[in-house]
């Protein structure tokens, strides 16, 4: 009898630990291949899949390009975007470029946002080349408050990649705040 | 299908100023440099300068950068080269022209005859 | 600037037999493992024709007697076996480095 008080004990201790791991916030989005911007100035990136492919979301809310947080706690964000041309696509307009993304926290209630993390590198891209490939990942740990935002800004948004395993940004939750 | 349709022949003044025009069409206008390239009467070709109409970025040979003067407007997907101060040496044929998708200069306009005469 | 020389400029040849043009740069023209450099036919009142690109491949359309060849400063354009329709200003061209050059023209006169 002990032992299959033990055993019951230990199944609703899994079941518990289990329904906290599925209720802990995460969401893994990748590009709208079909809605990138055009041009060279830096823009925000609006156009997200959250839910084919690669991409996911639970207890996060996607709205307006932006991914809100709904539950306070500290979160892992990360993005990866990145660079490519080739040839038969068309010209650069410049071969010098300046490659940036920048992940973004928009707050509602005191209206404010702050660049919580930004990458990139200026590079040379001859016009001579057949083919051209930059990569950028950038990941951090943030104390994120319920209602908040995460966007994305990047530069030379016609030159994105737009494969899934290619430019996508997300976040999950760690931990509670005490 | 790729085209340029450049504008009709133009008879001009010494010292006057003429601009021709390249409609583009059958592909994205503001992706690809659009190039100039003079040939005079029975003479070889001469490149130019080119403009990349997205952002109006511009070339130019060195001997023609107090000639001509590139624009180009994308709504109406149509580039323009303004020819200045014309003089005999600017009668000549102007050809608009774009790359290839793998090089060279694949796709011409069918030209614009300038002749300058007093 | 890059010039370009072709030789000869003038060509006369009979039906049939084979037609070489060379067009020599004043620098070289590869980079990135390729030879910026191609050939252009104009026939007469006619915008000029793109026959070769990237030294040695043949544009779509183009017949394939014709063909190029050679790499950084020396080029050539080979007709294997001219036809009548030949009869033209043929044209070498880089655009490796800016501004983009044409050599002074071979023309081809058939027999």
């Known amino acids: 009898i002990r032992a299959e008080k033990a055993m019951v004990d230990g199944s609703w201790l899994d079941l518990a630990k289990r329904s906290k791991l599925e209720a802990q916030p995460f969401a893994h989005l990748t590009i709208n291949a079909t809605d990138i911007p055009s041009g060279s100035h830096k823009v925000s990136l609006s156009s997200w899949y959250h839910d084919r492919g690669w991409a996911k979301i639970s207890n996060m809310t996607f709205s307006n390009g932006k991914l809100i947080v709904n539950q306070d706690g500290f979160y892992y964000l990360y993005a990866n975007i990145c660079f490519r041309h080739h040839e038969t696509s068309g010209d650069l307009a410049t071969e010098y470029l300046q490659l940036m993304v920048y992940v973004t926290k928009t707050s509602i209630k005191i209206p404010s946002s702050h660049t919580l993390m930004k990458g990139g590198s200026t590079k040379y891209w001859s016009g001579n080349s057949e083919f051209h490939f930059y990569s950028i990942n950038v990941g951090g740990f943030f104390k994120l408050r319920s209602g908040e935002e995460i966007s994305i800004e990047v530069s030379n948004p016609s030159l994105l990649d737009p494969d899934q395993d290619a430019t996508y940004f997300g976040a999950f939750k760690v931990r509670d705040i005490d | 299908q790729v085209q340029l349709q450049q504008s009709g022949a133009e008879l001009a003044s010494p010292g006057a100023s003429v601009k021709l025009s390249c409609k583009a069409s059958g592909y994205t206008f503001t992706t690809y440099w659009l190039q100039w390239v003079k040939q005079r009467p029975g003479q070889g070709l001469e490149w130019i300068g080119a403009?990349?109409?997205?952002?109006?970025?511009?070339k130019y040979t060195q001997k023609f950068k107090d000639k001509a003067t590139l624009t180009a407007d994308k709504s109406a997907s149509t580039a323009y080269m303004q020819l200045n101060s014309l003089t005999s040496e600017d009668s000549a044929v102007y050809y608009c022209a774009r790359r290839g998708s793998r090089r060279g200069i694949a796709y011409w306009g069918q030209g614009t005859l300038v002749t300058v005469s007093a | 600037n890059i010039v370009l020389t072709q030789s000869p400029a003038s060509l006369s040849v009979s039906l049939g037999q084979r037609a070489t043009i060379s067009c020599r740069a004043s620098?070289?023209?590869?980079?990135?493992?390729?030879?910026?450099m191609h050939w252009y036919q104009q026939r007469p009142g006619q915008a000029p024709r793109l026959l070769i690109y990237l030294a040695s491949n043949l544009e779509s359309g183009v017949p394939a007697r014709f063909s190029g060849s050679g790499s950084r400063t020396d080029f050539t354009l080979t007709i294997s076996s001219v036809e009548a329709e030949d009869e033209a200003t043929y044209y070498c061209?880089?655009?490796?480095?800016?501004?983009?050059?044409f050599g002074g023209g071979t023309k081809l006169e058939i027999k």
């Open positions: 620098e070289s023209v590869d980079s990135y493992g390729r030879s910026f």
């Open positions: 403009i990349y109409p997205g952002p109006g970025n511009t």
């Open positions: 061209q880089q655009d490796n480095e800016d501004p983009y050059t």
